[in-house]
Interface confidence: low
């Protein structure tokens, strides 16, 4: 069931209020963005649960087995043993065997390329999306999600890892980007700003949204996350922008109402299973897609990003709760946990719908500068 929490069809780029790049780092929307400092202060991205290997936190959940054999995600070296949620395990920055990405933060030292050389790669994320320059690709079919409606028990782990709030997902959540492009959901996490300062990672024509949700998936072609890192299509992230709306979003409230319990960095709690798909926009047919990277160290490339055209609506109070409840490292508030947009360096963003025609109110007439590259896969 879909809640009336979504803007019926809010095309990205349809001027909503909010500063462009509140941190003074103008996210240049041109496709020829010149490379910038890897991650200007306050504009970087986060890993996850244990500073896992990428897009925020590559999780502790494994994918469901496939017909050819049981593929599964073996926990990466950064996953820790169970602990008590009331005894915060402040290990977001501790050294872990086999984990080169333990020490990084948003803004300041060390520079991310020093943490992981891949962070200086040419095809990084997030990026600025310019609908006018997107290539309409009819081969991009509606996304398919299966098993995302979870029963209340067993409960799921919700953790403040010092970089974000992350919900670890159980086995069995299947997602298909198209025929033969099947994935298993691993975890989801959020990026946000601060009071009056939007904090989405991706931007649309330079516009930054209040917040952004990422649902991280592992391709069924790989048994483990570490195998998939850096491999084209090995990981896929579904991303949606969160905007302010008039009503409380009941799906998000199931998570936001628990944030006070995990205010301290490293703390965690359990939340009842919920309909994960209710956290996403209802329109699975209209989206942008491109190949990029994890937005946190190790910044591995080859990640397929799918950014929904429709946004998700949260109340002002909910957005405030998200940005003003959690604490990060060093007794600092966990805020502005987003990475600066990265240059496209010749990449073409594809759209599953004619975005250049009907999605940008700034266009005087239909324009389509790029052609679809995804010849039907």
């Amino acid at each position: 069931q879909r809640l009336p929490r979504m803007q019926e069809d809010s095309p990205l780029g349809g001027g909503s209020s909010g500063e462009d790049d509140p941190l003074g780092e103008e996210d240049l929307p041109s496709e020829e963005d010149s490379p910038r400092e890897e991650d200007p202060p306050g504009e970087e991205d986060l890993p996850g649960e244990e500073d896992l290997p990428g897009e925020e936190d590559l999780p502790e959940v494994k994918p469901k087995s496939e017909e050819e054999g049981s593929l599964k995600l073996e926990d990466l070296p950064t996953v820790e043993a169970p602990g008590d949620p009331q005894e915060p395990q402040n290990n977001a920055h501790r050294d872990k065997e086999g984990d080169d990405q333990s020490h990084w933060r948003y803004g300041g030292d060390p520079p991310w390329p020093r943490v992981s050389p891949a962070c200086a790669g040419r095809f990084q994320s997030p990026v600025d999306i310019r609908p006018q320059l997107a290539a309409f690709c009819p081969a991009l079919r509606p996304l398919e999600l299966l098993g995302f409606q979870l029963p209340p028990l067993p409960e799921l782990r919700l953790r403040n890892n010092g970089h974000s709030v992350q919900l670890t997902l159980p086995p069995g959540l299947e997602m298909a980007l198209g025929p033969g492009r099947e994935y298993r959901a691993l975890q989801l996490h959020l990026h946000w700003g601060a009071a009056g300062r939007p904090g989405s990672e991706h931007t649309v024509e330079g516009h930054r949204f209040p917040a952004e949700i990422h649902v991280v998936h592992l391709s069924t072609a790989f048994a483990r996350v570490d195998e998939a890192l850096g491999r084209p299509g090995g990981l896929a992230v579904l991303a949606a922008f969160l905007e302010e709306g008039p009503e409380e979003n009941s799906a998000y409230e199931q998570l936001l109402s628990r944030l006070e319990e995990i205010a301290e960095e490293g703390s965690e709690t359990q939340v009842p299973g919920l309909d994960i798909s209710a956290l996403l926009p209802s329109d699975f047919s209209r989206y942008f897609q491109y190949e990029g990277s994890l937005t946190t160290p190790p910044c591995a490339q080859g990640v397929i990003w799918t950014v929904f055209n429709q946004t998700v609506m949260l109340s002002a109070k909910q957005l405030h709760t998200l940005s003003d409840t959690l604490w990060g490292p060093g007794d600092s508030r966990l805020q502005l946990n987003f990475r600066a947009t990265q240059p496209l360096n010749g990449r073409v963003i594809e759209a599953s719908f004619p975005a250049g025609v009907d999605s940008s109110p700034r266009a005087a007439e239909p324009v389509q500068l790029n052609s679809c590259l995804a010849a039907g896969d």
Epitope: D75, L153, T269
Partner: antibody, heavy 115, light 106 residues
Framework: ELVESGGGLVQPGGSLRLSCAAS????????MNWVRQAPGKGLEWVSG????????YYADSVKGRFTISRDNSKNTLYLQMNSLRAEDTAVYYC??????????WGQGTLVTVSS | DIELTQPPSVSVAPGQTARISCSGD??????VHWYQQKPGQAPVLVIY???NRPSGIPERFSGSNSGNTATLTISGTQAEDEADYYC?????????FGGGTKLTVL
């Protein structure tokens, strides 16, 4: 720490209420479960309850006879057992179970159903 | 509901490797946890999420899970490892245990 109490000898058809006092972790944040073990037998999950009591689950063998509940203000988990049968004789453990297994188990309390 | 099947007993000589299996339909798509239980004591978690050791559990304990079978492996088995071992998983809100395996160290 989890400490069970309330076990004892009861006749078939009788009732018993088990309690589990929790300490050392944030009880109100956690789903809780009862697991039992008949003498010389294996572990059998009995019932589970969400952190806020909104959801309860039961094994088929006890459905309709047992009721799980909790009082977060007292950090206590309960299991009300009615219409007891001989096959309910077991050590009853309360346990905190999540996708990452049992973080904690109590030491158990013995329930004996016999005439 | 998923059913977990374990062998009733496994014997191993000290210093050798013990393997305890847990089978169930499509078990590889579920997380499996393993508990050790010694007489008169509560169960102790030794492996969680198929192959992860909680702190305090010796490195000789390891786990795997694929296809229809999960396996608990104890390398260099010691006398103190003699105990009952149970696999456990979840199936839509219900907790499921295997029947248990008695490990005898000869």
């Amino acid at each position: 720490e989890l400490v069970e109490s309330g076990g004892g000898l009861v006749q078939p058809g009788g009732s018993l209420r088990l309690s589990c006092a929790a300490s050392g972790f944030t009880f109100s944040n956690n789903a809780m479960n009862w697991v039992r073990q008949a003498p010389g037998k294996g572990l059998e999950w009995v019932s589970g309850i969400s952190y806020d009591s909104s959801k309860t689950y039961y094994a088929d063998s006890v459905k309709g006879r047992f009721t799980i509940s909790r009082d977060n203000s007292k950090n206590t988990l309960y299991l009300q057992m009615n219409s007891l049968r001989a096959e309910d004789t077991a050590v009853y453990y309360c346990a905190r179970l999540t996708y990452t297994g049992a973080y904690r188990w109590g030491q158990g309390t013995l329930v004996t159903v016999s005439s | 509901d998923i059913e977990l099947t374990q062998p009733p007993s496994v014997s191993v000589a000290p210093g050798q490797t013990a393997r305890i299996s847990c089978s169930g339909d499509n078990l590889g798509s579920y997380y499996v946890h393993w508990y050790q239980q010694k007489p008169g004591q509560a169960p102790v978690l030794v492996i969680y999420d198929d192959n992860n050791r909680p702190s305090g559990i010796p490195e000789r304990f390891s786990g795997s899970n694929s296809g229809n079978t999960a396996t608990l492996t104890i390398s260099g088995t010691q006398a103190e490892d003699e105990a009952d071992y149970y696999c456990q998983s979840y199936d839509f809100g219900k907790v499921v245990f295997g029947g248990g395996t008695k490990l005898t160290v000869l």
